[in-house]
Amino acid sequence: SGRGEAETRECIYYNANWELERTNQSGLERCEGEQDKRLHCYASWRNSSGTIELVKKGCWLDDFNCYDRQECVATEENPQVYFCCCEGNFCNERFTHLPEAGGPEVTYEPPPTAPTLLT
């Protein structure tokens, strides 16, 4: 959707900095868009010597870089902060790093949780 009618999507939500930023720490985020605007899910993380540190997850505003991506795949070679975005409910639950320049694909599976809906 996102063409002519408002779009609603649900994404996994997480904020590692939730105390300082006065937000919820984790749950589900329901994204409700404007007419003719797409909404996406995103994930961002750091990779410190193979240790994955989740930074943020949630809804992401209309962004052509995210169009028609069913999976959350970061393609930058070696950023300080990895970022991926995708279209589809909860598509940011799993996220992958697959650098455009080639190299091993690394997929991150979330630990099992019982998420709560953010309001």
Partner: antibody, heavy 120, light 107 residues
């Protein structure tokens, strides 16, 4: 249309307090955080903090901690920013700005600004 | 705090010129970057969010690029109404911070 209308210019003496209002219209007031940004004469933009109108939660820049208070009245869709113990270097234009509901949270609608002059 | 450094601080250009402004973050902010335009006596106006997404109603001659620490705002063909000051701003981590601004002046 979506609009933020701020209160008028203020002249204050050092040590006094000022309270600036920002009335929202054209959207659901409780659906978007409201940020405050100031700009001293001839200077750049300085972020002061935000209030979540739905919860009343606030987040202030460390520089203003203890001097700034952000509040809201949801019944009239209005946010307020009060700055106390004013000094001459608080002379600035103060803006309220709505942020988009979702990441990366750009400030997509701004008030027209309120000029606050601190002078003895 | 994340420092945002803009360059140049001012640029003189003519109508029709291509103008490029850069913004560097002191640490990685992924794509949590916005660009604003401000004219004298007016409030800032959002141009670009998420580093490269054009805000509704903003002319397509404005474009943004970059990710991580280095970002660019480009005006492909400068128009008379584009003479203004431009600010970058990061929203990746609190406190949110702005660049010092770039004034685009008439040559």
């Amino acid at each position: 249309q979506v609009q933020l209308v701020q209160s008028g210019a203020e002249v204050k003496k050092p040590g006094a307090s000022v309270k600036v209002s920002c009335k929202a219209s054209g959207y659901t007031f409780t659906g978007h955080k409201m940020h405050w940004v100031r700009q001293a004469p001839g200077q750049g933009l300085e972020w002061m903090g935000w209030i979540n109108p739905a919860s009343g939660w606030t987040n202030y820049a460390q520089k203003f901690q203890g001097r700034v208070t952000m509040t809201r009245d949801t019944s009239i869709s209005t946010a307020y920013m009060e700055l106390s113990r004013l000094r001459s270097d608080d002379t600035a234009v103060y803006y309220c700005a709505r942020v988009s509901m979702y990441a990366p949270e750009p400030m997509d609608v701004w008030g027209q600004g309120t000029t606050v002059t601190v002078s003895s | 705090d994340i420092q945002m450094t803009q360059s140049p601080s001012s640029v003189s250009a003519s109508v029709g010129d291509r103008v490029t402004i850069t913004c560097r973050a002191s640490q990685g902010i992924s794509r949590w970057l916005a660009w604003y335009q401000q004219k004298p006596g007016k409030a800032p106006k959002l141009l670009i969010y998420a580093a490269s997404s054009l805000q509704s109603g903003v002319p397509s001659r404005f474009s943004g690029s970059g990710s991580g620490t280095d970002f660019t705002l480009t005006i492909s063909s400068l128009q008379p109404e584009d003479f203004a000051t431009y600010y970058c701003q990061q929203a990746f981590s609190h406190p949110w911070t702005f660049g010092g601004g770039t004034k685009v002046e008439i040559k």
